[in-house]
């Protein structure tokens, strides 16, 4: 049974041009995370593997950077940029769990930092 | 010890597909990616794709969208790569190799050689 | 596309000559968020599949050698063997794992003189 929990940033927004830290905490279980892939829609951005470290997508490696722990940086931002962000953590034994952050980027200098939520 | 062995040499005709097999023993399958390199005599090596097992995600060289379809069947260890619509221009080697982030193509396979011939 | 050209083409060597070989790429391949480059270096001797020998442009693959070393960093790099042994006579081919397409040079052709 699947009893965790994905903790993420939720909804933010950032400049254009700047840069923003995405990141999900897995708790209140006591599965071992052996793997987390950073999505963007479909397109994978970057693995974080227990064993073999980061790998960062060739696509991204000018705007993607690794961590802090298993978030992920983004940045030179665009409003391109603006969507659906998912950390998917492979576990062992519970399995999958996703959590999802939508980040919007804004032109002007009015952004701010939505508040955190919680997704079973 | 880490093995990729690839299905055998290949005479097919014209206009045919040909589907190339490349089984992995020795490492988790689903931690590395699977590239696949041609290789002709005077045009040296060139990156057809590559596909994450793990997750299925595939990449492309633009040049060979359309040619070559990569898949792979976690159940087995096996990657696949399937040419299709080949002409002369497809006859090469074409190795399978495996690849993760920072450590570049640590292991080959033998190469399989695709001749298209009428 | 990163382009990667290698010279020279071809290297005649004598056995327990020391030669170097070099990969020059269009663009950067260091990596800034852990200051680490992209390139790597095959050796394909005639009638193998090519050989992994440095990665992150001078870390040795476990097994080489260490008579194979590599250097350089940026746009500039270089394969030095410091004794060539006969089994070394191959082509040598540097490749950048950057960014999509993956791409590699040319080759370097290491022939006995």
């Known amino acids: 049974m699947m009893t965790g929990t994905i903790e993420t940033t939720g909804n933010i927004s950032a400049e254009k041009g700047g840069s923003i830290i995405l990141q999900c905490h897995l708790s209140s279980t006591t599965a071992q995370v052996t793997q987390v892939n950073w999505e963007q829609q479909d397109q994978l951005l970057a693995i974080c593997n227990a064993d073999l470290g980061w790998h960062i997508s060739p696509s991204f490696k000018d705007r993607v950077a690794p961590g802090p722990g298993l978030g992920l940086t983004l940045q030179s931002l665009t409003v391109n940029d603006t969507g659906e962000y998912f950390c998917i953590y492979h576990t062992y034994p519970d399995g999958t769990y996703t959590g999802r952050i939508f980040l919007e980027v804004l032109e002007s200098s009015v952004a701010e930092h939505g508040a955190r939520f919680q997704i079973p | 010890q880490v093995q990729l062995q690839q299905s055998g040499d290949e005479l097919v005709r014209p206009g045919t597909s040909v589907k190339v097999s490349c089984q992995a023993a020795g490492y988790t399958f689903t931690n590395y990616w699977i590239l696949w390199i041609k290789q002709r005599p005077r045009h040296g090596l060139e990156w057809i794709g590559d596909i994450y097992p793990g997750g299925h995600y595939t990449n492309y060289n633009e040049k060979f969208k359309g040619k070559a379809t990569l898949t792979a069947d976690t159940s087995s260890s096996t990657a696949y790569m399937q040419l299709n619509s080949l002409t002369s221009e497809d006859s090469a080697i074409y190795y399978c190799?495996?690849?993760?982030?920072?450590?570049?193509?640590?292991?080959w396979g033998q190469g399989t050689s695709v001749t298209v011939s009428s | 596309d990163i382009v990667m050209s290698q010279s020279p083409s071809s290297l005649p060597v004598s056995v327990g000559e020391k030669v170097t070989m070099s990969c020059k790429s269009s663009?950067?391949?260091?990596?800034?968020?852990?200051?680490?480059?992209?390139l790597a270096w095959y050796q394909q001797i005639p009638g193998q599949s090519p050989k992994l020998l440095i990665y992150?442009?001078?870390t040795g693959e476990s097994g080489v050698p260490d008579r194979f070393t590599g250097s350089g960093s940026g746009t500039d790099f270089t394969l030095t063997i410091s004794s060539v042994k006969a089994e070394d006579l191959a082509v040598y081919y540097c490749q950048q794992y950057y960014s999509y397409p993956f791409t590699f040079g040319s080759g370097t052709k290491l022939e006995i003189k």
């Open positions: 992150w442009a001078s």
């Open positions: 190799t495996r690849y993760y982030g920072p450590y570049a193509m640590d292991y």
């Open positions: 663009q950067s391949l260091l990596y800034n968020s852990n200051q680490k480059n992209y």
